[in-house]
Structures are given as C-alpha cells and as structure tokens.
Interface confidence: medium
C-alpha cells in the first residue's frame, strides 16, 4: 500500500476546521475490515485518531478529530481537525496498514490575522517641528509572529529607532507593539505595516501630523 499526503503545509485559521489529506490506493476486493489506520503526532507519537478492526475508534485528541467514514473504502484516510488551536500546529503522520504498511507526514501551519493597528502618540499635544515623539503601533491576536515595517509619507522605510516586541497570550496568539521614535518635521505621515508572514496579510495603520489636530 502506498500512502500519499500533500507536500505543502496545510494552513488553517484559528477556530476554523482543517482537513489533513491522506490517501491510499485500495486493491480490488478491499474491505474496511482489512484496514488499520492511525493518525498520530509525528514528534511525540501521541495517538490522534484511529480506525481498526473494521470500526472508527474515535478521537484520542481532545475530541476534535474525525475521519470521513463514507470515503474510507475509496482510499480517503483524511483527518478533519475541528476548531483549530495554536497548539495543534505541527506534523501529523498518517499510518495505513492493510496487508503491508506505509506512512507519510503532513504539516499543519496555524495562522490568525492581525487586527488593524492602533496608533498612539506621546506626547500628543503641543507638538512642534523638531520635537522628539514616540509613535506606538499596536496590533493584536495574530499568529504566527508578525513583521512590522515603518514608512514615512513618501514611502521611505524608517528603520532607525524602532523597537518591536511581541508577546503571546494564553491562547498562543501574539500581540505586537512597535515603537518608533522620530523627530517631527513641519508635517508628516508615519505609517506602520503589520505583516502576517504565513497569510501574507498586511494590516496598516498611520498617523498624520499637520500641526493640529492629529489624524489617525
């Protein structure tokens, strides 16, 4: 028996369902009574789901997995993972045994989009050209870690005096805070771009300083 899986990682959004595809080519006369199917975590060998002795043995992984029972006889051994969490990320191995045995691993990459950045300015009043200001760009609840880029109103990258920090919350999602320290010109726009490298998703925030008032 030959097991086939996708070579590319499966990308799943947090809180959505994901399908880890795995297939085999059944011989003529194949019956499910002959099939032993095991899904496990590749690194830890922890059992995730199994089908043995002609029946679905169910989920051994937080009761969020399912097979496609009507498709098994056609060689579809795919696994459905429900309500994906950050902690589900990793490699899953599909083992199929009929008369002989084969296995293959498929990677699950979890992702979550970042929120539209909020911009704060310190100080936020009585601003004059030549003043040093601190602009903070904050974006929340994304995964994996973001990349943050700053640009001025002409689109020129601002790379000096930038400090970016990221912290995971209890769900494993990241909040990112990027601080730009800059000397004000007569007027100017400062924008930050928060990029999710998996989703190739960009979230933009900007602040325009034109004397008074400020525009966010």
């Amino acid at each position: 028996v030959e097991v086939q899986v996708s070579e590319d990682p499966v990308v799943a959004l947090v809180d959505t369902d994901a399908t880890l595809r795995c297939s085999f080519s059944p011989e003529p006369g194949f019956s499910l009574a002959q099939l032993n199917l095991i899904w496990q975590l590749t690194d830890t060998k922890q059992l995730v789901h199994s089908f043995t002795e002609g029946r679905d043995q169910g989920s051994a992984y937080s009761n969020r997995t399912a097979l496609f029972p009507d498709l098994l006889v056609q060689g579809n051994a795919s696994l459905r993972l429900q309500r994906v969490r950050v902690t589900d990320e990793g490699s899953y191995t599909c083992f199929v045994s009929i008369q002989d045995f084969d296995s293959a691993a498929v990677s699950l990459q979890v992702a979550a989009p970042y929120s539209k950045p909020s911009m704060t300015l310190e100080p936020n009043k009585d601003l004059r050209p030549g003043n040093m200001v601190t602009i903070t760009c904050s974006s929340y609840q994304g995964y994996p870690e973001a990349e943050v880029f700053w640009k001025d109103g002409q689109g020129v990258p601002l790379t000096g005096n930038v400090t970016t920090s990221q912290m995971a919350n209890e769900r494993g999602l990241f909040d990112v805070h990027s601080v730009l320290r800059v000397v004000l010109g007569a007027n100017g726009t400062y924008s930050c771009l928060v990029r999710n490298p998996v989703l190739q998703q960009d979230a933009h925030g900007s602040v325009t300083i034109t004397g008074q008032p400020l525009t966010f």
């Epitope: 990459q109 990349e147 943050v148 880029f149 970016t164 209890e170 490298p197």
Partner: antibody, heavy 122, light 108 residues
Framework: EVQLLESGGDLVQPGGSLRLSCAAS????????MSWVRQAPGKGLEWVSG?????????YYADSVKGRFTVSRDNSKNTLYLQMNSLRAEDTAVYYC??????????????WGQGTTVTVSS | EIVLTQSPATLSVSPGERATFSCRAS??????LAWYQQKPGQAPRLLIF???TRATDIPDRFSGSGSGTDFTLTISSLQSEDFAVYYC??????????FGGGTKVEIK
C-alpha cells in the same frame, strides 16, 4: 544534510570591525528565521540578533549590541551575516548561527553551526 | 525582558541515576520554553521544545514538563554521554530571546 557553517571570526582591536558569515545548506534557507547566539569564555548562551524572512528580513537585536551590530541575509547565496562595529572586550565570544525549528516564526533553534571565535583585545 | 533562572547551577549525579533540574521564568511564558544540551567545545543541541515535546532523535529518557513560570527537565537514567550543561530558553516574549544561566551535570 542540513548544515550551518560560520566563518569570519578573528582577533580584533577594541573599536574595530568584523563581519561574520554563516553559510546554510540542505534546507530552504529563505523560509527560515535565523539567529546569532554568542557564548563568552566560560559563560552561558546569549541571543545577539535575529532576522525574519519577509522583504529581505526584519532585524532584531539584544540591547547590548543595538546600534553596533547589523544582521542581514542574502537568500540567493543562502548566507546569513553579522556586521560587528565598535567592538568591545565584552564582545569576545564564540558566535553561533542558529536556524529556527519552524518556518515563519521565532521558536527554538534546531540547527546550529560549529561556531566562530571573536576575540577583542589590544 | 524575561529572566530565566536555572537551578541548581551544578548537579552531581551517578550514571544510571535520575536527574531533575529547574527553570523558572520571571513572568508567565505559557509553554514557550526549550531545553538545550551543550558539551564542551560543541554547539548547543535542541532537546525539548514547547516545554515537553522531544526534538527529533532525542532519546525518551529526556522529558520536559511545566507551564507558566515553572519548568523541569528530567533525565530518567543518566548515561555517560549526558554529562553536559543544560540551558533553557524562552520564546514567548521577544526580543530578546532569553536563555537561563545553565545547569552543569557532572559525574558524582
């Protein structure tokens, strides 16, 4: 075989400059975040700098080297660099490059080079 | 910056014995902790990630546990090749990535 190979370590005077290189092979270099980690003689490990993958890489630094060291990468050459300026005696260490365990993020480093020695002394 | 404190600094153990050492974080880091082994003159080697998952080809005598601020690395039965320095590293809040000061495991 997945491999990282550092080079460029040398004896340099305080205030001097040095450029370290880390040549990667056996994996898709452009998909992995990379780090430099150093170890002073008889001391523990200290993360120095890291670089991400998008747009040629966002750079991150430890406070102790910020403004003096610059990390960069050339994905076409599968090479990571560390430009070290205004070197101080306390920068004396073995410098390792490390590959992150998983693409797209900082996690833990599962592939390390053998290290290159930087000595700052007059 | 998250500070990781490892204890003890040195652990004297006989081959075949169990070794347990600790890593404490200055603030909660969930399960975002790794353990490395380093032998003299060698680069570090990843043992454990996500606090408890063994890296590829790491023997099952190595196990990690803990979450939040308190973590433990256990070697169930020390082999001669296990005498080394062990470091923990957090990746929950960065930059910087931070390492603990290390625990040296020496032969009793």
């Amino acid at each position: 075989e997945v491999q990282l190979l550092e080079s460029g370590g040398d004896l340099v005077q305080p205030g001097g400059s040095l450029r370290l290189s880390c040549a990667a092979s056996g994996f898709n270099f452009s998909s992995y975040w990379m780090s430099w980690v150093r170890q002073a003689p008889g001391k523990g490990l200290e993360w120095v700098s890291g670089i991400s993958i998008s747009y040629g890489g966002n750079a991150y630094y430890a406070d102790s080297v910020k403004g003096r060291f610059t990390v960069s990468r050339d994905n076409s050459k599968n090479t990571l660099y560390l430009q070290m300026n205004s070197l101080r005696a306390e920068d004396t260490a073995v410098y390792y490059c490390g590959r992150d365990r998983s693409p797209y993020q900082y996690r833990s480093m599962d592939v390390w080079g053998q290290g290159t020695t930087v000595t700052v002394s007059s | 910056e998250i500070v990781l404190t490892q204890s003890p600094a040195t652990l004297s153990v006989s081959p075949g014995e169990r070794a347990t050492f600790s890593c404490r974080a200055s603030q909660t880091i969930g399960n975002k902790l790794a353990w490395y082994q380093q032998k003299p003159g060698q680069a570090p080697r990843l043992l454990i990630f996500s606090a408890s998952t063994r890296a590829t080809d790491i023997p099952d005598r190595f196990s990690g546990s803990g979450s939040g601020t308190d973590f433990t690395l256990t070697i169930s039965s020390l082999q001669s090749e296990d005498f080394a320095v062990y470091y923990c590293q957090q990746y929950n809040n960065w930059p910087p990535l931070t390492f603990g000061g290390g625990t040296k495991v020496e032969i009793k």
